[in-house]
Interface confidence: medium
């Protein structure tokens, strides 16, 4: 027998630094955890103990603070060549800054391979990108050599910006003749890593012939076996293990998100390449496991040029810019209709002749909004007024509702109004008129929604049964502020771009803005 | 082969404005920051400020922030800097130079271009 | 902003000598072990070279007559068997914080 010891990370989006318990800024740091400098300590010390060794990432290492903000992905590649990464899988925020803002700092920088079965190359891009990405990588791993297979959400040309010149093919019929390749090669233990959420996870186990482990992403996805150390609550067992068509147990592993727990899989394979054995658990990258020095020296020197940044002007603003607690959970505030448009605008994907958008609807908790900006500071914006504005460290996530889910939310919304409560919904592409003459639970009498499969872009009444998508706080797609609804009943959730970075980028594209009340939300007559 | 390469002398009237280039070779431009830095006849180096060509971050020295912007054009790979209100004592030779702060050298200078002379007078 | 000083402000020497240059920052620019002060030589009518980044690290081509060291705010750099072609100014320069500022220099002259 030979065993082999998988360490694996997915959906880091930019934690270099370590982070709070939930991920955001660290505050106390004796309480923190995460960040490559820990990450570093804890995979040199199973290096040290363990003779076969793979250090994998299931990609969206891009997006989602300051550091992707300013270095642009040149900080990936530097870090996870430090930290001696073995294979990477793209993921859909690797083409957030379109596919020259993946190869000039992440493809042509990285010292290890990156990989993606099912994403394929046309035009002039083909021979531009031959070579940075590939669909596989065989590793010698001591004496034996192991196959890593690639693959990406093929929704990623809704979820990011890789242009006209990359197809996503399905994934299962583009692993497949990859995997046949390898078996041709002589290669008989195949690792399928790969940015496709859970639910794809599981069926690749299951339908590709020949993957003996799959190591997934994009789902946040936490698995654990016995009691979890710290908040998050399993989805399931770890490793997961699914019945393969064939008859095999192939086990399915992610690691959350966050770079908050290292995966920790040890597999065992017979010397014909199947899977005797595998169990592990993620690790918790807590404060019990010191930062390495050099790396976080590293840290510190890098960080040098990211303080100045945050009080740079991005952009200005001639208005007021309401976001204070007095209106926007109380009615409609310009603040909301701004992070509401920025939103959308950053979610603009013209992938269908039919529609002008794949998406035209925002909601915004109220009580999401921490701060207004004061136009009469020579009308500057900087990324510090933003922090105070969205200080929370979150994502605006893209989610598909049925019509009801979404007439349930502005129910919600004003179920207890008057109470300055946080989830009095602030929003872009709905006309909603509320009565609050009605019992809760019936007070919304108008709720219309602009129209994606159209020209001309025009409001029509909601329709219950429709399937809609939606741009909304993480927090919301989570349940938060009571949204018990949004989480139990979304059909699909796909996480965004960090929300300070939506709205800066957002700004500095307008270069002057003048948000408006503009009759949004209303209040019908006598009730307000 | 890593090189900067300047834009030629420059002959400037008080009052004026001057924009010199920088055209870099050998490594990718958008993962290195570029500094600009001065030095007037027989004096020492100052540092006016830099750029990071892949996000176009910018940092200047307070000295010089309401006259001096940087730029940077990643098409091409070439930096710019632009002094405005031009006066006696800008009279200098303008350096660009790549700073190694994303490998080893820490935002030292590693590489520098070979000096543009602005001569302001009236 | 950082003051960075340097002392002497010239320093004539033979050519087989010591030279020991001093570079004083207002403040510490140290940290986590690593010291954020570089050194570069230039000569009249050339651009400043590179000669010693983060206070004792010989950057790649430097001849290794030159040495550098120091930790917080006192720094040195050292010219071991001093050549002719040593004649020149050296600069050191700070990156601990924006902005970043150099020294007025040493200038060094050969008999």
């Known amino acids: 027998a030979w065993e082999l010891t998988i360490l694996h990370t997915n959906d880091v989006h930019s934690r270099l630094e370590q982070t709070s318990e939930d991920s955001s800024k660290c505050v106390n740091a004796s309480r923190c955890m995460g960040g490559v400098a820990r990450l570093f300590t804890k995979v040199q010390q199973i290096r040290r103990a363990e003779p076969n060794v793979l250090l994998l990432d299931a990609g969206d290492q891009y997006q989602g603070t300051i550091w992707f903000t300013v270095y642009k992905g040149a900080e990936v590649a530097h870090f996870m060549n430090a930290l001696r990464y073995d294979a990477m899988a793209l993921g859909n925020h690797e083409f957030d800054n379109g596919v020259e803002g993946l190869i000039e700092p992440l493809l042509k920088e990285a010292k290890f391979p990156i990989l993606s079965a099912n994403i394929k190359a046309k035009g002039p891009l083909a021979s531009q990108i031959s070579g940075l990405y590939l669909p596989y990588k065989v590793l010698p791993v001591g004496d034996e050599v192991v196959g890593i297979v690639g693959y990406t959400s093929k929704e990623t040309p809704f979820l990011s910006n890789p242009g006209t010149n990359l197809v996503f093919e399905d994934e299962i019929t583009a692993l497949q003749p990859e995997v046949d390749k390898l078996k041709t090669l002589n290669v008989n233990k195949i690792i399928a890593l790969g940015h496709s959420g859970f639910e794809m996870d599981k069926l690749i186990a299951q339908k590709v012939r020949g993957v003996d482990v799959v190591v997934g992403g994009h789902s946040n996805t936490f698995l654990y076996t016995g009691n979890p150390p710290s908040k998050e609550v399993p989805a399931g067992k770890y490793p997961f293990i699914v019945t393969s068509d064939d008859g095999r147990k192939v086990p399915v592993v992610q690691a959350y998100a966050f770079g908050k727990y290292l995966g920790y899989l040890k597999i065992e394979f017979d010397e014909r390449g199947n899977v005797i054995s595998s169990h592990g658990n993620p690790i918790l990258l807590n404060s019990s496991i010191p930062e390495d020095p050099s790396i976080k020296a590293d840290i510190n020197k890098w960080r040098i040029k990211l303080d100045n940044y945050s009080t740079q002007e991005l952009g200005k603003t001639i208005v007021y810019l309401d976001g204070s607690s007095q209106s926007c959970r109380f009615r409609e505030c310009n603040m909301g209709n701004l992070i509401c448009d920025a939103m959308i605008n950053n979610n603009l994907r013209h992938t269908d002749e039919m529609f002008w958008n794949h998406v035209s609807m925002c909601i915004l908790n109220g009580g999401g909004i921490r701060s207004p900006i004061d136009e009469r500071n020579n009308g500057t914006i900087t990324w510090e007024n933003l922090a105070a504005v969205l200080p929370f460290g979150g994502t605006f996530d893209l989610v598909q509702l049925k019509g009801s889910t979404l007439k349930k939310a502005f129910e919600h919304s004003v179920h207890r109004y008057g109470q300055s409560t946080g989830e009095f919904l602030q929003v872009g592409g709905i006309h909603v008129v509320y009565d609050l003459s009605r019992k809760p639970g019936d007070r919304v009498v108008k709720l219309d929604v602009l129209c994606t499969k159209c020209r001309v872009p025009s409001y029509d009444p909601l329709k219950m049964d429709e399937v809609y998508k939606v741009i909304l706080p993480n927090f919301l797609a989570n349940g938060g502020d009571g949204f018990q609804m949004i989480k139990d009943e979304l059909l699909r959730h796909d996480s965004g771009d960090q929300d300070i970075n939506v709205v800066s980028t957002y700004i500095s594209k307008m270069k002057v803005i003048y948000p408006a009340v503009e009759g949004r939300i209303k209040f019908s007559t006598g009730s307000h | 082969e890593v090189q900067l390469v300047q834009s030629g002398a420059e002959v400037k009237k008080p009052g004026a404005t001057v924009k010199i280039s920088c055209k870099v070779s050998g490594y990718t431009f958008t993962s290195y920051w570029i500094t600009w830095v001065r030095q007037a006849p027989g004096q020492g180096l100052e540092w006016m400020g830099d750029?990071?060509?892949?996000?176009?971050?910018?940092n200047y020295n307070e000295k010089f922030k309401t006259r001096v912007t940087i730029t940077a054009d990643k098409s091409t790979s070439t930096a710019y800097m632009e002094l405005s209100s031009l006066r006696s004592e800008d009279t200098a030779v303008y350096y660009c130079?790549?700073?190694?702060?994303?490998?080893?050298?820490?935002?030292?200078?590693?590489?520098w271009g070979q000096g543009t002379l602005v001569t302001v007078s009236s | 902003e950082i003051v960075l000083t340097q002392s002497p402000a010239t320093l004539s020497l033979s050519p087989g000598e010591r030279a020991t240059l001093s570079c004083r920052a207002s403040?510490?620019?140290?940290?986590?072990?690593?010291?954020?002060m570089h050194w570069y030589q230039q000569k009249p009518g050339q651009a400043p070279r590179l000669l010693i980044y983060l206070a004792s690290n010989l950057e790649s081509g430097i001849p290794p007559r030159f040495s550098g060291s120091g930790y917080g705010t006192d720094f040195t750099l050292t010219i071991n068997n001093i050549e002719s072609e040593d004649a020149a100014y050296y600069f050191c320069?700070?990156?601990?914080?924006?902005?970043?500022?150099f020294g007025q220099g040493t200038k060094v002259e050969i008999k």
């Open positions: 403040k510490n620019v140290s940290t986590s072990g690593y010291s954020y």
């Open positions: 320069q700070h990156s601990r914080e924006l902005p970043f500022t």
């Open positions: 750029i990071y060509p892949g996000s176009g971050n910018t």
């Open positions: 130079a790549k700073e190694g702060g994303l490998t080893t050298e820490d935002y030292a200078l590693d590489y």
